[in-house]
């Protein structure tokens, strides 16, 4: 059996010119709703019936998942990071096999001293988090280690991290050139072999809000775009108001279709509206006016 749900209707005209009569509450709400039987078929676009309502997949919403949302949540990470794999040669410590054992007194003391030295070297780099020794080997002591950098996510995070990695390179080059053994003496916390300093690899967090936005928009990827507000990215369709890319439908409603955003123009008791942006109003002749 079918139940008829009464709704007030507003006449809408698409910008192509055809007039359609739709409910004023939600243009996708069906006037008749199946009360019994298989509910699965009423959830469109991959949505599923949970026993009470349709659970819609992004970017859809509505009773039958037929509407396309105006904005999609994208969540950039709070912080972004970079990891630099570096090698330096420490000449002021004799290598022993005990240094390979991370639980030995030798390793713990070396790690403590090396960390203190690097904290001094990299002080003044706001993105600097710390160092992590990954391997120690003979020659005097070849120290393979990671320098960890972190910063708050902003649209310019890559530039900030790239700049920080450059400063790390400059500072490690400077200290390993200056703090060297002279006449078998090292007056610093640690001394280095200048030629043993190498940057092996740099890994930077990859986060692209545009890519996330496009992925989540699925078949509407060409019509969703990223705009920033207070350094935060928003994934929006032109139907979302308040952004540079927002479509102004004037006397109408913006609706997403697979061909992009279009305006559905309103027809009131006194006027009908047309045009791509529903900005062309035509007054109805008086004898068509119904009280």
């Amino acid at each position: 059996p079918l139940a008829t749900i009464p709704v007030s209707t507003t006449s809408l005209t698409s910008s192509e010119g055809s007039t359609i009569s739709t409910p004023s509450v939600d243009i996708s709400t069906p006037v008749t709703t199946s009360i019994v039987g298989d509910q699965c078929s009423r959830c469109k676009n991959g949505g599923f019936w949970d026993g009470l309502k349709c659970q819609c997949l992004t970017p859809y919403y509505g009773e039958s998942c037929e509407e396309v949302v105006n904005s999609i949540d994208i969540a950039p990470p709070e912080t972004v990071s970079a990891q630099m794999e570096l090698t330096v040669t420490v000449t002021s410590v004799k290598f022993t096999d005990e240094l390979k054992n991370h639980s030995s007194q030798e390793f713990r003391e070396f790690n403590k001293t090396f960390t203190e030295q690097m904290n001094i070297v990299y002080s003044g780099i706001p993105e600097y988090v710390g160092v992590n020794i990954t391997n120690l080997r003979l020659g005097s002591v070849v120290v393979e280690h990671d320098v960890l950098l972190r910063t708050k996510y902003t649209p310019e995070y890559k530039t900030a991290l790239d700049n920080a990695t450059e400063v790390v390179k400059q500072k490690i080059t400077k200290v390993t050139t200056e703090q060297i053994m002279t006449n078998d003496n090292c007056s610093a916390l640690m001394c280095f072999n200048t030629t043993g300093t190498q940057v092996q690899n740099i890994t930077v967090t990859q986060y692209d809000p545009v890519e996330e936005c496009r992925q989540k928009a699925e078949e509407y990827e060409d019509y969703f775009l990223v705009e920033y507000r207070d350094q935060k990215p928003y994934c929006i369709s032109p139907c979302e108001s308040g952004f540079n890319a927002s479509k102004n439908c004037n006397h109408g409603k913006c609706q997403m279709s697979q061909n992009g955003a279009r305006c559905l123009c309103v027809t009131t008791e006194t006027h009908w509206y047309s045009g791509e942006d529903c900005n062309q109003g035509t007054q109805k002749s008086h004898h068509h006016h119904h009280h």
């Epitope: 004799k94 003391e109 403590k112 090292c186 610093a188």
Partner: nanobody, 124 residues
Framework: EVQLVESGGGLVQPGRSLRLSCAAS???????MGWFRQAPGKEREGVAG???????IYADSVKGRFTISKDNAKNSLYLQMNSLRAEDTALYSC???????????????????RGQGTMVTVSS
């Protein structure tokens, strides 16, 4: 973590002697060791140092009067101070490097372990 505890300080008359000891909680065989002092209102200065292979070095102001030595079996460092002067009055502390430290044959080396110190007052 190596704990260093100094002892032997006190009040002594000019020209007399004192022997300071520094007991370490761990192995000092493969460490550079040193004695530092800080007089009231002055900066800390290196007094004497001994490298991991037993080579010693002294500040000019104490050369010929002070002798640094270490007993690896007892994990102890010593400073024999003779012909003491009023200007030797200071808080004396010992320091130790990390294990296997080389190239610390000078007094400016930054040691990573330090004791609390023992006070030496030279006065008549």
């Amino acid at each position: 973590e190596v704990q260093l505890v100094e002892s032997g300080g006190g009040l002594v008359q000019p020209g007399r002697s004192l022997r300071l000891s520094c007991a370490a909680s761990g192995d000092i065989t493969r460490r550079c060791m040193g004695w530092f002092r800080q007089a009231p209102g002055k900066e800390r200065e290196g007094v004497a140092g001994i490298s991991e292979d037993g080579i010693t070095i002294y500040a000019d102001s104490v050369k010929g009067r002070f002798t640094i030595s270490k007993d690896n079996a007892k994990n102890s460092l010593y400073l024999q101070m003779n012909s003491l002067r009023a200007e030797d009055t200071a808080l004396y502390s010992c320091a130790a490097s990390i294990l296997n430290r080389v190239g610390c044959r000078q007094l400016s080396y930054e040691y990573i372990y330090r004791g609390q110190g023992t006070m030496v007052t030279v006065s008549s």
